[in-house]
């Protein structure tokens, strides 16, 4: 397929990479697949500076990331590696917490509304970001 | 004009599969998500899938999950769906459909005029 | 899954009638439904997406309202080309999901 060289409608470009941020709520899941299927994923924050851009663009608004436990150790949706990768949790997070009374802990991190992460139920439904690189070998998107 | 054209429908007998295909034209097809939607005899419709622009991505129907594949080939302007393990319930019109252009619109604008798939035995 | 539930799922009517037909999603789905019709032995037309907009070329006889989980089809003045089977759809999470099916027929 061709290279996508600039980034679909109503998404916004930022540092060779288009993100677009949703104004509604779904589970983690649901915007998962939302993501997926515009050919992208859920945002993979590789750097302070891409973490105070989505944080500026995000607002003070809990809003999923493409990070999670859901089967067992800590995962960035893309593959990239998050042992050794940027990370910003709240201070004591991320708890696993049981006790919010919803079955289970809690394994989808989320940026808070002061942009430092926490883990949370996947099933709340937050605001998500999606991410896609730009030059990687794909089919254009489409424009309305 | 757009078009969407099915072909690949016949009987089948059960656990036996099929591959339809779907032949798309007046419309840039690699900038568009596709469906596939099946309707039973005297029934309704009900979402069998959907496919991403590149083909990177696909969702099923629990109902088909693990039995039916779909796929494009953007350089041939074609669709498939291969369909394997077939079930007497499988039996329907199976109607290929392009989605609706807008970022999260999963709506189906364009339908093709749908092809037939019987299992019986 | 989101449960879409259409009713009535058959309906007798004259031509000039005013007819309406209701969606009720089991979840919010914000704006996220269509309408499509369906004449036998054909395949589904859109007609009306994200609740209220219509698609290209569709008469202004046919509206959709709602949003939430409550939603509506009307045609307001009935013709005798608008006796057929209306689907609403919802597309705000996958599965994506139909309603059963509204019959319009000729009384």
């Known amino acids: 397929g061709s290279e996508r060289t600039c980034c679909p409608v109503n998404w916004v470009e930022h540092e060779r990479s288009c993100y677009w941020f949703s104004r509604s709520g779904k589970a983690w899941a649901d915007a998962d697949n939302y993501c997926r299927l515009e050919d992208a994923h859920l945002v993979v924050v590789t750097s302070w500076e891409e973490q105070k851009f989505v944080q500026h663009h995000i607002g003070p608004v809990n809003t999923w990331m493409g990070l999670h436990d859901q089967n067992g150790p800590w995962k960035w949706v893309d593959g990239t590696d998050y042992e050794t990768g940027f990370k910003n949790w709240r201070p004591e997070q991320p708890d696993d917490w049981y006790g919010h009374g919803l079955g289970g802990g809690e394994d989808c991190a989320h940026f808070t509304d002061d942009g430092r992460w926490n883990d949370d139920v996947c099933q709340r439904p937050y605001r998500w970001v999606c991410e896609t690189e730009l030059d990687k070998a794909s089919q254009e998107p489409p424009l309305l | 004009q757009v078009q969407l054209v099915e072909s690949g429908g016949g009987v089948v007998q059960p656990g036996r599969s099929l591959r339809l295909s779907c032949a798309a034209s007046g419309f840039t097809f690699s900038s568009y998500g596709m469906h596939w939607v099946r309707q039973a005899p005297g029934k309704g419709l009900e979402w069998v899938a959907i496919i991403s622009y590149s083909g990177r991505n696909d969702f099923y129907a629990d109902s088909v999950k693990g039995r039916f594949t779909i796929s494009r080939d953007n350089s041939k302007n074609t669709l498939y769906l291969q369909m394997n393990s077939l079930r007497a319930e499988d039996t329907a019109v199976y109607y290929c459909?392009?989605?609706?252009?807008?970022?999260?619109?999963?709506?189906?604008?364009?339908w093709g005029q749908g092809t037939t798939v019987t299992v019986s035995s | 899954d989101i449960q879409m539930t259409q009713s009535p799922s058959s309906l007798s009517a004259s031509v000039g009638d005013r007819v309406t037909i209701t969606c009720q999603a089991s979840?919010?789905?914000?704006?996220?439904l269509s309408w499509y019709q369906q004449k036998p032995g054909k395949a589904p037309k859109l007609l009306i997406y994200?609740?209220?907009n219509w698609e290209t070329g569709v008469p202004s006889r046919f509206s959709g309202g709602g949003s939430g989980t409550d939603f509506t089809f009307t045609i307001s003045s009935l013709q005798p080309e608008d006796f057929a089977t209306y689907y609403c759809q919802q597309y705000e999470n996958l599965p994506l999901t139909f309603g059963g099916g509204t019959k319009v027929e000729i009384k």
């Open positions: 459909a392009r989605r609706i252009a807008a970022a999260g619109h999963y709506g189906m604008d364009v």
């Open positions: 979840q919010d789905i914000y704006n996220h």
């Open positions: 994200d609740a209220s």
